[in-house]
C-alpha cells in the first residue's frame, strides 16, 4: 500500500513575494527498489504536479519554470525550490515518489507555504563623499534576492548627470558626476521583480561637497535698510562715526569658513574677524580702505572685497587755515 513519510522541519514556511524559498524534503532512508520512481510535488487537492523530474509529465502552467524539484537520491534530497514567489503560491504542498508502473508510492506529509508582502527595500551605498565635478559610483543592492530568481530590473532616477555601470543579479552601479546644484536633491533606486510583478524603491538625498560659488556682503548702515554687494566694489561712501555691520555670506558644502581681513590679505594673513560678521562700531580714518571677506573651503576658496570711503563731518575736522 501507499507508504507515508514525514517532512522534516516546520509545518509551514514564510517567503516574501518575489523572493525564493526552499521546501526541505528528505527521502526515507529505507526505500525499496521497486518503489523508486519519479518525484512529484503537488499542490494539495491537485492532480497535476507543480514540479517533477518525470520527462513525460506536464506541470502546472502557473508554476512552470518557478518551481523545481531538487532531485538527488544519493543525498536523499527531494526538496522543492520556489523562486519568484507569488501571492497565489500561498498553499499546502506535498511530495510523492512513484513509478507510473506501480500502484503505490511514497507520500510525504503536507507543508504550508505562506507568501507575504515584500518588506525588504533596496540599499543605496555611496563610497566616501560626493564631490562636485568628480565621478562617484553609487551601488543599489538587494542582497536578500536569491541568485536563482528572475533577475530584478533596476531603475535610477536623479537630476544629476549619471551613467549606468555594471550590474549583477543583486546590484546595479550608477556613476554620478554631481554639480553644486544637485546638493540636497533626491536620488531614487527602483527595483522591479518581473517574476512576481512587485516594485520596491529607496530614495536618498544627495550630499554634494562643493567649493563656494558665490560670496556676497550685506551691509547694515545705521538704521537704513541693508544692501547686498555681489562683486568687488571700488568705493563705498560711509559717514564718519557711523556704525557699520558687514555680513559675509557664501554657499558651498560643507559650509565654508568665513573670515574678514583688512586690505588684500596674503594666504597666511591674520583675520580681523573669524566669523562672517564684521562689526565697525564707529567708522573713522583707520577704517578707510579695503575690507576682504574670504570663504575658505577644502575644495577651493573665494573672496570678495569692498573699499570704504569715509565722508567727514564738517565740524569734525581739526585745525584751520
Amino acid at each position: 500500500q501507499e507508504r507515508r513519510f514525514q517532512l522534516e522541519g516546520p509545518e509551514s514556511l514564510t517567503v516574501q513575494e518575489g523572493l525564493c524559498v526552499l521546501v526541505p524534503c528528505r527521502l526515507p532512508t529505507t526505500l525499496p527498489a521497486s518503489y523508486y520512481g519519479y518525484g512529484y510535488w503537488f499542490l494539495e487537492g491537485a492532480d497535476v504536479p507543480v514540479a517533477t523530474n518525470d520527462p513525460d509529465e506536464e506541470v502546472q502552467e502557473e508554476t512552470r519554470g518557478r518551481f523545481h524539484l531538487l532531485w538527488d537520491p544519493r543525498r536523499k534530497n527531494c526538496s522543492l525550490s520556489i523562486r519568484d514567489a507569488r501571492r497565489r503560491d500561498n498553499a499546502a504542498y506535498f511530495f510523492r515518489l512513484k513509478s507510473k508502473w506501480m500502484k503505490y508510492g511514497y507520500t510525504s506529509s503536507k507543508l504550508s507555504v505562506r507568501v507575504m508582502a515584500l518588506t525588504h527595500r533596496p540599499n543605496i551605498s555611496i563610497p566616501g563623499t560626493l564631490e562636485s565635478g568628480h565621478p562617484s559610483n553609487l551601488t543599489c543592492s538587494v542582497p536578500w534576492v536569491c541568485e536563482q530568481g528572475t533577475p530584478p530590473i533596476f531603475s535610477w532616477m536623479s537630476a544629476a548627470p549619471t551613467s549606468l555601470g555594471p550590474r549583477t543579479t543583486q546590484s546595479s552601479v550608477l556613476t554620478i558626476t554631481p554639480r553644486p546644484q544637485d546638493h540636497s536633491t533626491n536620488l531614487t533606486c527602483q527595483v522591479t521583480f518581473p517574476g512576481a510583478g512587485v516594485t520596491m524603491e529607496r530614495t536618498i538625498q544627495l550630499n554634494v561637497s562643493y567649493a563656494p560659488q558665490k560670496v556676497a556682503i550685506s551691509i547694515f548702515q545705521g538704521n537704513s535698510a541693508a544692501f547686498k554687494i555681489l562683486q568687488n566694489t571700488s568705493s563705498l561712501p560711509v559717514l564718519e562715526g557711523q556704525a557699520l555691520r558687514l555680513l559675509c555670506d557664501a554657499d558651498g558644502n560643507p559650509p565654508a569658513h568665513l573670515s574678514w581681513f583688512q586690505g588684500f590679505p596674503a594666504l597666511n594673513a591674520t583675520p580681523i574677524s573669524n566669523t562672517g560678521v564684521l562689526e565697525l562700531p564707529q567708522v573713522g580714518s583707520a577704517e578707510e580702505g579695503d575690507f576682504t571677506c574670504r570663504a575658505q573651503h577644502p575644495l577651493g576658496s573665494l573672496q570678495i572685497s569692498l573699499s570704504l570711503f569715509v565722508h567727514w563731518k564738517p565740524e569734525g575736522r581739526a585745525g584751520g587755515v
Partner: antibody
C-alpha cells in the same frame, strides 16, 4: 517467498505465434509493474516490454513493437507475452521480472527458439 | 532511444582487487541507473538502483556512483563469487535499455 515462474517457451517456426506466461506468488501482484526481458544465446540482456500494475499503461522495445503484446490477469496473478510473427532473431531466454523503474525480482526464464 | 555503453567489455582481475566498471548514457538520465549481476545459466540479480542505492542483501563491497551521463560500479575487494557479467540499465525513459555487459574473469 517471492517467486516468478515462466512457462510456454519452446521451438516455433518463423512467422508463427507463441504465448508466454508468468505465474507470480509471494507478493501482491496487482500492485506491481511487470517486465519481460530477453537474452539471446551468448548475448546481453535486452529489455522487451513493461506493463503497469493495472494494465492501463504498456511500453515496448522498438524491435518487438506491433508484434508482441504484454498483458496481465491480476485475478490469476499471471503475466503474459503474446508473440506474433516470430523471427529467428527473437530466439532467446525470456525472463519475467517484477518492478517499476527498477527490476528487483527475476524469474528463471523460459527458452524460445524460432527455427524452421 | 537512450544508448548505454559499458567499458570495458571484459576484465581480468584477482581476488582482493579493487575493480571499477563504467557506464555512459547517450543523454542525461539523472540518477535512474541500475546495476545487475548475472552468473552463467542464472537470472540477473539487482545490485544497485538509483545509481548509488545498495539493494537489500547485497554485500557492502559493491557501490555505485554517478549522475547525468557517467556512472561507475565499484567492487572494493573482489571475492571469488563476484566473477560474473555485470549490466547497467537506464530506467529514465522507455525503452529501458541495458548496456552490452562487462564480463569479469579470474586472472
Amino acid at each position: 517467498e517471492v517467486q516468478l515462474l515462466e512457462s510456454g517457451g519452446g521451438v516455433v517456426q518463423p512467422g508463427r505465434s507463441l504465448r508466454l506466461s508468468c505465474a507470480a506468488s509471494g507478493f501482491t501482484f496487482s500492485s506491481y509493474g511487470m517486465h519481460w526481458v530477453r537474452q539471446a544465446p551468448g548475448k546481453g540482456l535486452e529489455w522487451v516490454a513493461v506493463i503497469s500494475y493495472d494494465g492501463s499503461n504498456k511500453h515496448y522495445a522498438d524491435s518487438v513493437k506491433g508484434r508482441f503484446t504484454i498483458s496481465r490477469d491480476n485475478s490469476k496473478n499471471t503475466l503474459y507475452l503474446q508473440m506474433n510473427s516470430l523471427r529467428a532473431e527473437d530466439t532467446a531466454v525470456y525472463y519475467c521480472a517484477r518492478g517499476g523503474q527498477t527490476i528487483d525480482i527475476w524469474g528463471q526464464g523460459t527458452m524460445v527458439t524460432v527455427s524452421s | 532511444d537512450i544508448v548505454m555503453t559499458q567499458s570495458p567489455s571484459s576484465l581480468s582481475a584477482s581476488v582482493g582487487d579493487r575493480v571499477t566498471i563504467t557506464c555512459r548514457a547517450s543523454q542525461s538520465i539523472s540518477s535512474y541507473l541500475n546495476w545487475y549481476q548475472q552468473k552463467p545459466g542464472k537470472a540477473p540479480k539487482l545490485l544497485i538502483y538509483a545509481a548509488s542505492s545498495l539493494q537489500s542483501g547485497v554485500p557492502s563491497r559493491f557501490s555505485g556512483s554517478g549522475s547525468g551521463t557517467d556512472f561507475t560500479l565499484t567492487i572494493s575487494s573482489l571475492q571469488p563469487e563476484d566473477f560474473a557479467t555485470y549490466y547497467c540499465q537506464q530506467s529514465y525513459s522507455t525503452p529501458y535499455t541495458f548496456g552490452q555487459g562487462t564480463k569479469l574473469e579470474i586472472k
